[in-house]
């Protein structure tokens, strides 16, 4: 049995209310914390040792229809000179998250939970293999 | 999972010029590394090259280096291999490959391959 943290409290139904078939739910699409401030960044996109690009992938039946991929410009990292290293290997770093899919059935739209593989950004890695000659 | 589709093979005359076409699908193609290796009848795998996610950097083995342009699209999820001045002795299976470390596709060790396309250069 989950116990809730302090300040936590676990959503009790009242008894009164109608039953929701199993698997479905009402959703607000209103975000909370909407305004929040994002911290500077100050460019560590460009400043990484394994920098990265940003792409803005857009899809209208997708909830938000907007999200922001990377993908590492590098093969190598970049040493302190600024020249590309191919003996240390850039990666993404990816975060698997949840969004809406829309489905149209008819008149009625509904929305399904869709994981989606999302890449935030790159770092420098040692290579696992070596190559002998 | 990522597949890979490899095309534009075929029979072309020494000199002329031929571009391979690996198309792919499934998680997305912009966070993977992707190249091109061949294997010539009776030999080994052999790299050609890789570009990086964002295409901004390639790498090719020096043999290939000039005669060979690798390049990608990802808005069209499709990586690109143009040949040049072809030989005889450029006759192979061309494979695609994908891997989210550059390190592990350079040396064969690839989570993801095409299933090749064969290119022979004869007159």
């Known amino acids: 049995q989950r116990v809730p943290k302090e300040g936590q409290t676990f959503f009790q139904k009242p008894e009164s209310c109608p039953s929701v078939p199993e698997g479905s739910l009402k959703l607000d699409l209103g975000i909370i914390n909407a305004n929040q401030r994002v911290p500077l960044s100050r460019n560590i996109e460009r400043r990484s040792t394994s920098p990265w690009n940003y792409t803005v992938t857009w899809d209208p039946n997708r909830y938000p229809s907007e999200v922001v991929q990377a993908q590492c410009r590098h093969l190598g990292c970049v040493n302190a000179q600024g020249k590309e290293d191919i003996f240390m290997n850039s990666v993404p770093i990816q975060q698997e998250t949840l969004v809406l899919r829309r489905k149209h059935q008819g008149c009625s739209v509904s929305f399904q939970l869709e994981k989606l593989l999302v890449t935030v950004g790159c770092t420098c890695v040692k290579p696992l293999i070596h190559h002998v000659h | 999972d990522v597949q890979l589709v490899e095309s534009g093979g075929g029979l072309v005359q020494p000199g002329g010029s031929l571009r391979l076409s690996c198309a792919a699908s499934?998680?997305?193609?912009?966070?993977?590394?992707v190249g091109w290796f061949r294997q010539a009848p009776g030999k080994e795998r052999e790299f050609i090259g890789a570009?990086?996610?964002?295409?901004?950097?390639?790498y090719y083995a020096v043999s290939e280096k000039g005669r060979f342009t690798i390049s990608r699209d990802n808005s069209k999820n499709t990586l690109y291999l143009q040949m040049n001045s072809l030989r005889p002795e450029d006759t192979a299976v061309y494979y695609c490959?994908?891997?989210?470390?550059?390190?592990?596709?350079?040396?064969?060790?690839?989570?993801?391959w095409g299933q090749g396309t064969l290119v022979t250069v004869s007159s």
């Open positions: 499934g998680r997305t193609f912009s966070s993977y590394v």
């Open positions: 570009i990086s996610g964002s295409g901004e950097s390639i």
């Open positions: 490959t994908a891997d989210q470390e550059f390190g592990y596709l350079r040396f064969g060790r690839s989570e993801y």
